[in-house]
Amino acid sequence: VFIFPPKTKDVLTITLTPKVTCVVVDISQNDPEVRFSWFIDDVEVHTAQTHAPEKQSNSTLRSVSELPIVHRDWLNGKTFKCKVNSGAFPAPIEKSISKPEGTPRGPQVYTMAPPKEEMTQSQVSITCMVKGFYPPDIYTEWKMNGQPQENYKNTPPTMDTDGSYFLYSKLNVKKETWQQGNTFTCSVLHEGLHNHHTEKSLS
């Protein structure tokens, strides 16, 4: 049995619905019945969506239950527990998850234009440095003239010397696209920010 946290973007965007997910694997087709119970701070809740078991390539079954949660419950450190009952288990299996402890610190965000030396290439790199944040859960994306872009890569959050985290995000664009004066925006979601959001632009 595995329990997974909600997606960072879902937790930090008020209009999305974060979900804690419980997954049971290696269920025998001879005893496929699995029952999920969910608890928030040890109080049972009944709002989970449990999907029909799915057959896997190794002939076992996989069962998934998703609990939609309130953003604040996750961010305020409540504990989410998934309890799984099955005839195949000698006793119910419980798995719990909550947000890592510690005081949130919002990131500083800096954007950097392509280096002069790179302008000889047909593709250039626009860089976003995101530093000084805690916890490491963060969502970073790029927009051009307000439109989401896909041609970017983020480094994983890395611990800095002061215990906070940093990352770099690199957007690749055609040199002509950069030279045309388009506006490029590095957009960051983190719980330490006002409304969880900040962005920095350059053109």
Epitope: L12, T13, I14, T15, L16, T17, H71, R72, H194, N195, H196, H197
Partner: antibody, heavy 117, light 107 residues
């Protein structure tokens, strides 16, 4: 730059309805709720409710449940509040406000509604 | 509904003076409290969120404090542009509710 642009003043007769638009720009419309607030001389500021533009879900202050209907037109980034069965008590300034995890960081300029025969 | 009682309802203060406005909730609101400033003919502007966090661009002379049911907004040294009406708002429970406002005028 985040902007919420509301329509100009409205003068309507008792018993009629009115639909107030709020045009959003400068951010991703579906990433924030749109809240609506009433400001009258008698009752200061009152929260009417909000709409989630991503899902269309709404939450209303029970005091306004039979008075207001919140909708959005996603493709145009416009939120609407319709007020029905208007009386003189509905005379007020109505604001839209962008609602994130932290309340109301940007507000519209307000629409003045006057209900009078 | 949670009732937000703001005091005083109006006050006069001198330039450079330290000013404190309070807001009391009818129950614990878990620090989900914001403060707004409104000038005549303008829409409200957020100053403080989650009881004590200053919005970017708001002068550092503004500060918020409090927890549980009791909260306050302090202006450390009053400036002319600070006159207006100040409102608190609880964002802990629906329906969200505002305080009745404090009208701050310069002596």
């Amino acid at each position: 730059e985040v902007q919420l642009l509301q329509s100009g003043p409205e003068l309507v007769k008792p018993g009629a309805s009115v639909k107030i638009p709020c045009k959003a720009s400068g951010y991703t419309f579906t990433d924030y709720n749109m809240d609506w607030v009433k400001q009258s001389h008698e009752k200061s500021l009152e929260w009417i409710g909000y709409i989630n533009p991503y899902s269309g879900d709404t939450i209303y202050n029970h005091k306004f449940k039979d008075k207001a209907t919140l909708t959005v037109y996603k493709s145009s980034n416009i939120a609407y509040m319709e007020l029905r069965s208007l009386t003189s008590e509905d005379t007020a300034v109505y604001y839209c406000a962008r609602g994130g995890y932290d309340y109301g960081d940007h507000w519209g300029q307000g629409t003045t509604l006057t209900v009078s025969s | 509904d949670i009732k937000m009682t703001q005091s005083p309802s109006s006050m006069y203060a001198s330039l450079g003076e330290r000013v404190t406005i309070t807001c009391k909730a009818s129950q614990d609101i878990n620090s989900y409290l914001s403060w707004f400033q409104q000038k005549p003919g303008k829409s409200p502007k957020t100053l403080i969120y989650r009881a004590n966090r200053l919005v970017d661009g708001v002068p550092s002379r503004f500060s918020g404090s409090g927890s549980g049911q009791d909260y306050s907004l302090t202006i450390s040294s009053l400036e002319y542009e600070d006159m207006g009406i100040y409102y608190c708002l609880q964002d802990d429970e629906f329906p969200r509710t505002f305080g009745g406002g404090t009208k701050l005028e310069i002596k």
